[in-house]
Structures are given as structure tokens and as C-alpha cells.
Interface confidence: low
């Protein structure tokens, strides 16, 4: 059976070595194995981790678990059938769902967020759906670096 | 498809002339990955229509250079035409630049299926007149 000549790559993608971002005149270059789209860089994992493991993997690459500006943000992969951990967790202190940078979840982003179990973490499908799952479950994850 | 190949090969493939506001000199709404720009289409087209659509965007119908790229594209999009075809089931599969395509394409024994599709980490043959999502690529 023929298959593609393998490069010297890991069996599953993980964020690459910590490369300083190279700016060009009006935008950016992303690290190897990261996707550039609308002046953001995204790492889309193919391996599954718990929510905390995902958060730490993103942090180790000077990025954070995906914080969505709007449901069109991942338009380029809206055909994907997968769910991915994103950087949303429930804060007992603020009694609100907060992104990793401390900002509150817009009620317009996920209309069903009121039904989310506050003990769970949020997995997102790029066509706009979100669901809450045990934070110990393993999912793929998306890291994001905002570049401008 | 072969009549279009000639026309396609004579096309200019200079993506840098397009508006390049986004990462790594790619046109707006394209994505960058590993020194290439990709247009992730959502429209369904026949294989020949897809070929022409990519040519009109100064790029090529999706080519896949290695397993890593195939894995990445399968994460981004479940299926897409690729720039591989054959003139009939008696002819070899070839790429857009006329080179023999050596990798396995499923269902190759079906004489009606003469254009190739990437589908979730595998390559399959399909009817060239089918309406399938297409992606374009330009190497930086």
C-alpha cells in the first residue's frame, strides 16, 4: 500500500518549539505548525488532553486556550465535526463564565450557556456549537495567539 | 479534464499581487500554514470548475505534499477536491504538473471515477462532474 513519504514529524501534533513571532509590515508570521488567519495564529491539536493539560500546553507556547471574539472566528474550519477545549471556565467568585483573560462570556456567543453545568469545562465546535463536559474528559484543543 | 490542464499550467500563480493584509502575505480570508496559503472553500463545484476557480484566484487546486499536510487539512476540512486526475481508468493518476501520482487512491477500479478527493486522511476517486467542496493552495 502506498502512503506519503513521512517527514520527521511526531505522530501527533503538539505546539512547536517556542519561536519568537516574526512581524512583517502589517501582520505576522506564525510558528511552524500553527495556522494564520485574520492576524491571529492558532494551534489546532490532533491529540486529546484534559482541559487543564490543554491550558498548560497553550501557556507553554505563550498562547492561551481559544478565546472567541465571535462565532465566525474559526470560519475556515466550520466544516469540522470535532469539538475542542476552549479557554472558558466558570468563576465561583464572579458567578460568571470567564475567559482566561478575565473577561466575561458574551450572552450572545452561546445562547444556551445558562444550561451549562458550572462544574464543567466548555468544548466548542467551529460551526458555532458549544457543550459542557467534565474537565477531566480528553478533547482536542485550540491555542490562540493574538498578533495585533 | 486534460484540456483544462494546459490552460491552467499557462496561468500566472503570483498570489502576492492580491491584497495581502493577513499573515504571511496571504490574501484576505485565506489561511497560512507551513509556508503556503490556502483558500478554504465552502462552495461545491465540479473538479473542472474548481480548477478554474483556483486559477482565477492565482493559485492551484489543492495539492498535498506529505502526510503531515494531509493530516492538517483533514482537521480543517473533512473533504476537498485535490489536483490529481486521470484521463480514464486505463491511464495513470497524475498531478497538475503531469507527474505520476504514486499514492493510493481508493476506488480506483471504478471506471467512472477519474478525479481525486481528500476525505478524512484518505484519498478517494470521485466522478469529476460531482459537486464537492474545493480548496486552493499557493506556496509562498
Amino acid at each position: 500500500k502506498n502512503s506519503f513519504t513521512k517527514l520527521s514529524i511526531e505522530p501527533a501534533f503538539t505546539p512547536g518549539p517556542n519561536i519568537e513571532l516574526q512581524k512583517d509590515s502589517d501582520c505576522c508570521s506564525c510558528q511552524e505548525k500553527w495556522v494564520g488567519y485574520r492576524c491571529n495564529c492558532y494551534f489546532i491539536s490532533s491529540e486529546q488532553k484534559t482541559w487543564n493539560e490543554s491550558r498548560h500546553l497553550c501557556a507553554s507556547q505563550k498562547s492561551s486556550l481559544l478565546q472567541l471574539q465571535n462565532t465566525d472566528e474559526l470560519d475556515f474550519m466550520s466544516s469540522s465535526q470535532q469539538f475542542y477545549w476552549i479557554g472558558l471556565s466558570y468563576s465561583e467568585e464572579h458567578t460568571a463564565w470567564l475567559w482566561e483573560n478575565g473577561s466575561a462570556l458574551s450572552q450572545y456567543l452561546f445562547p444556551s450557556f445558562e444550561t451549562f453545568n458550572t462544574k464543567n469545562c466548555i468544548a466548542y465546535n467551529p460551526n458555532g456549537n458549544a457543550l459542557d463536559e467534565s474537565c477531566e474528559d480528553k478533547n482536542r484543543y485550540i491555542c490562540k495567539q493574538q498578533l495585533i | 479534464p486534460s484540456t483544462l490542464i494546459q490552460r491552467h499550467n499557462n496561468s500566472s500563480l503570483n498570489t502576492r499581487t492580491q491584497k495581502a493584509r493577513h499573515c504571511g502575505h496571504c490574501p484576505e480570508e485565506w489561511i497560512t500554514y507551513s509556508n503556503s496559503c490556502y483558500y478554504i472553500g465552502k462552495e461545491r463545484r465540479t473538479w473542472e470548475e474548481s480548477l478554474l476557480a483556483c486559477t482565477s484566484k492565482n493559485s492551484s487546486l489543492l495539492s498535498i505534499d506529505n502526510e503531515e499536510e494531509m493530516k492538517f487539512l483533514s482537521i480543517i476540512s473533512p473533504s476537498s477536491w485535490i489536483g490529481v486526475f486521470r484521463n480514464s481508468s486505463h491511464h495513470p493518476w497524475v498531478t497538475m504538473n503531469g507527474l505520476a501520482f504514486k499514492h493510493e487512491i481508493k476506488d480506483s477500479d471504478n471506471a467512472e471515477l477519474n478525479c481525486a478527493v481528500l476525505q478524512v486522511n484518505r484519498l478517494k476517486s470521485a466522478q469529476c462532474g460531482s459537486s464537492i467542496i474545493y480548496h486552493c493552495k499557493h506556496k509562498l
Epitope: - | E43, R44, K106, E112, L113, G129, I132
Partner: antibody, heavy 124, light 107 residues
Framework: EVQLVESGGGLVQPGGSLRLSCAAS????????IHWVRQAPGKGLEWVAS????????DYADSVKGRFTISADTSKNTAYLQMNSLRAEDTAVYYC?????????????????WGQGTLVTVSS | DIQMTQSPSSLSASVGDRVTITCRAS??????VAWYQQKPGKAPKLLIY???SLYSGVPSRFSGSRSGTDFTLTISSLQPEDFATYYC?????????FGQGTKVEIK
Amino acid sequence: EVQLVESGGGLVQPGGSLRLSCAASGFTFSSYYIHWVRQAPGKGLEWVASISPYDGYTDYADSVKGRFTISADTSKNTAYLQMNSLRAEDTAVYYCARSSDFSPWTSSGGMDYWGQGTLVTVSS
Amino acid sequence: DIQMTQSPSSLSASVGDRVTITCRASQSVSSAVAWYQQKPGKAPKLLIYSASSLYSGVPSRFSGSRSGTDFTLTISSLQPEDFATYYCQQYGSSLRTFGQGTKVEIK
């Protein structure tokens, strides 16, 4: 010769269950999409569900989602439609059909081969 | 879901007539439309796929065309065996849908 043969239809009470089978022969089963399409007496065609036997990808019409389950056994070249919580409006002739499969989200042409159909009657 | 609105629901025609049946998709399905013929008590038969491709073994008097989201089945010269019900079907969406059908009767 390509053949699709349905079986398993019959009379069932509302709320009951039934499993239809579609035995395929004469083609490479896993290279095609298998569909169930139904036709209520004197009415038009309604697509019910689809499966890609190669990877098990399924789709359902909203009218049956959660009640019907489509599956396939590639070792037996057979597709199934498990129908639960049946209602009077599910009464129809159920056909299985195939179409070329190149992606879980589209099929390459129409449904080129059909079975002869099996009648499902839901009545008390 | 994508709706396929088919018209007319029935028509009367004579042998030799040119018959046109139309289907309008509620949103874009590209060329992913098929046409079928069905006779009473029988399974449907595929006539046209990809909007305009004639399925093998189907007489050339049948043809299909597309204009945007409008699809047309034309029978150039109606034959006695063509009296039947015709359906359009879209497969541009994973949730496939059929038109309501057009019954072609003898005038």
C-alpha cells in the same frame, strides 16, 4: 449484477419497534453510501437516513432523529434501520438505495440502484 | 433543511409533447441535484445526476439544466412509457431532500 433487497417490514403498534435490513450484492459495499427513503401511501418520497459503511458516518432526517438508527455490517454487506417509538405517520414503503460515496457530506450523483421496498404499517 | 419546491404538481400532455418540470432549491446546492422517474408500485429510477448529467441507459430525450438554484427536467418528445411521477432531489446538503413530485398524465 447490483442488487439491494429489503426485509423486515410488517405491522407494528404505535410505540413499537421494527428493524429493517438491506442486503447488498454485486458491488463493493463499503465504497458506496446507503440510504433509506420512504414513501407513505399516495405520497411523495422522503429521505430518512444515510450511512457510509466505510467509516460509519450517518445522517438523519429531523422527522426520525432520535428514534431511528441506521447501521451497516460490512462483513455481511447489509445495512439496517432500527426504528423505535413508531408512529402512525411512519407508515410507508421503505426503500434502501445506494449512491457513490466520496465524502460524508455529499454523494457524487443520484441514488442509482434501489431495492423493491418493504411495507411498514404502524397501526393499533 | 434545504427545501426543494417542485412545479407543477401534475400536468397533462400528449405523446410527442415537450414537457418541462422545474425545481427550486431554498438555498444553493451547487449542481448537486438528481431527477428520478417513478411508476406506480415500483422503485424510483435515476434519470439525471449533477443537475445535467444523463445517467447511463436513460434515453437522450431526457435532459436536465441548472440556473442558479433553479433546476429543470425536460422531456423533449414525450413517449407512452414516460407517463409517470418525477421527483427532484438535492444532495448538496447532508440532509438530502426531495421535491413533492410531478405526475405526468395522458391528456
